[in-house]
């Protein structure tokens, strides 16, 4: 039985050219995690292997930094970074929890940190 | 099996600069941060920073910025911390540690510095 | 910055007694919450990763638990050997920050 429960930064907003931390946190479970995902849309950014460390895909290497913890710090933010990331924890023995950000590029200097939510 | 061979001891004047160096092995050092963590004699553990080999990413302590500056030489699998204007306050044990998201897993054995005139 | 405060400062312990060391956090950290121990004249050694994630080669004896701010590293029967300093660390934002320590010592 999956007990665990997501936390995610939620709906969140930030400037053109400026960074912005994408955060997942697993909680009210016992269970392993081996591996997460970080995913843009069907595009993956990184993985961070409880094993192997971390593996950037290529094409994000010179703008993502891994952290803090098991989250990644996107940076020099573009409109087209707009859309929905996913954070895909793999644990033994519960299996995959999946939380959902959704981030908007704002050209302004009106962006806000949206509220935490929950993914039971 | 990963290991983490720190450069040894070091005994400096006030002023000077400093460079050690941790040398990673067993793993690949551009899938981990390296974290640098400070020991003063009797004291806790405090956070300097952290460099990530794999893009040159690196995170400061504020209260370290200007003081400790992070490198690495992905082709040496070597991180370095160069201290500046040495006084007695920086007279501690410095400690490389790497972080793959996970905790900090591996430490090297520390570098004692003396700064002393 | 996210202050980690340790209690208490120092535990006096009979080997076989069971112990508990508390850490609380300034602002809500989730489960980023790392205990590490420390033997004299040693480098710190990961414990219990993310509140309560046991580490392979630690013994089973050390547990964590907690979420939030309040988070607590357990010892069922401590052994000579388990004597020295404990940290904990959080990995929820930069900076990493450590709590100040837990001695435990022998009473």
């Known amino acids: 039985m999956m007990t665990g429960t997501i936390e995610t930064t939620g709906n969140i907003s930030a400037e053109k050219g400026g960074s912005i931390i994408l955060q997942c946190h697993l909680s009210s479970t016992t269970a392993q995690v081996t591996q997460v995902n970080w995913e843009q849309q069907d595009q993956l950014l990184a993985i961070c292997n409880a094993d192997l460390g971390w593996h950037i895909s290529p094409s994000f290497k010179d703008r993502v930094a891994p952290g803090p913890g098991l989250g990644l710090t996107l940076q020099s933010l573009t409109v087209n970074d707009t859309g929905e990331y996913f954070c895909i924890y793999h644990t033994y023995p519960d299996g995959t929890y999946t939380g959902r950000i959704f981030l908007e590029v704002l050209e302004s200097s009106v962006a806000e940190h949206g509220a935490r939510f929950q993914i039971p | 099996e990963v290991q983490l061979q720190q450069s040894g001891t070091v005994l400096a004047r006030p002023g000077a600069s400093v460079k050690m160096s941790c040398k990673a092995s067993?793993?690949?050092?551009?899938?981990?941060?390296m974290h640098w963590v400070k020991q003063r004699p009797g004291q806790g553990l405090e956070w300097i920073g952290g460099?990530?080999?794999?893009?040159?990413?690196?995170n400061y302590n504020q209260k370290f910025k200007g003081k400790a500056k992070l490198t690495a030489v992905t082709s040496a699998s070597t991180a370095y911390m160069e201290l500046s204007s040495l006084t007695n306050e920086d007279s501690a044990v410095y400690y490389c540690?790497?972080?793959?998201?996970?905790?900090?897993?591996?430490w090297g054995q520390g570098t004692s510095v003396t700064v002393s005139s | 910055d996210v202050v980690l405060t340790q209690s208490p400062a120092t535990l006096s312990v009979t080997p076989g007694d069971s112990v508990s060391l508390s850490c609380r956090a300034s602002?809500?950290?989730?489960?980023?919450l790392h205990w590490y121990q420390q033997k004299s004249h040693e480098s710190p050694r990961l414990l219990i990763k993310?509140?309560?994630q046991s580490i392979s080669g630690i013994p089973s004896r050390f547990s964590g638990s907690g979420s939030g701010t309040d988070f607590t590293l357990s010892i069922n029967s401590v052994e000579t050997e388990d004597f020295g300093m404990y940290f904990c660390?959080?990995?929820?934002?930069?900076?990493?920050?450590f709590g100040g320590g837990t001695k435990l010592e022998i009473k």
């Open positions: 660390q959080q990995s929820y934002s930069w900076p990493y920050t």
């Open positions: 993310y509140s309560s």
């Open positions: 540690t790497r972080e793959g998201g996970y905790g900090m897993d591996y």
């Open positions: 067993g793993y690949s050092i551009t899938s981990y941060w």
């Open positions: 460099v990530y080999p794999g893009n040159s990413n690196t």
């Open positions: 602002q809500t950290i989730s489960n980023n």
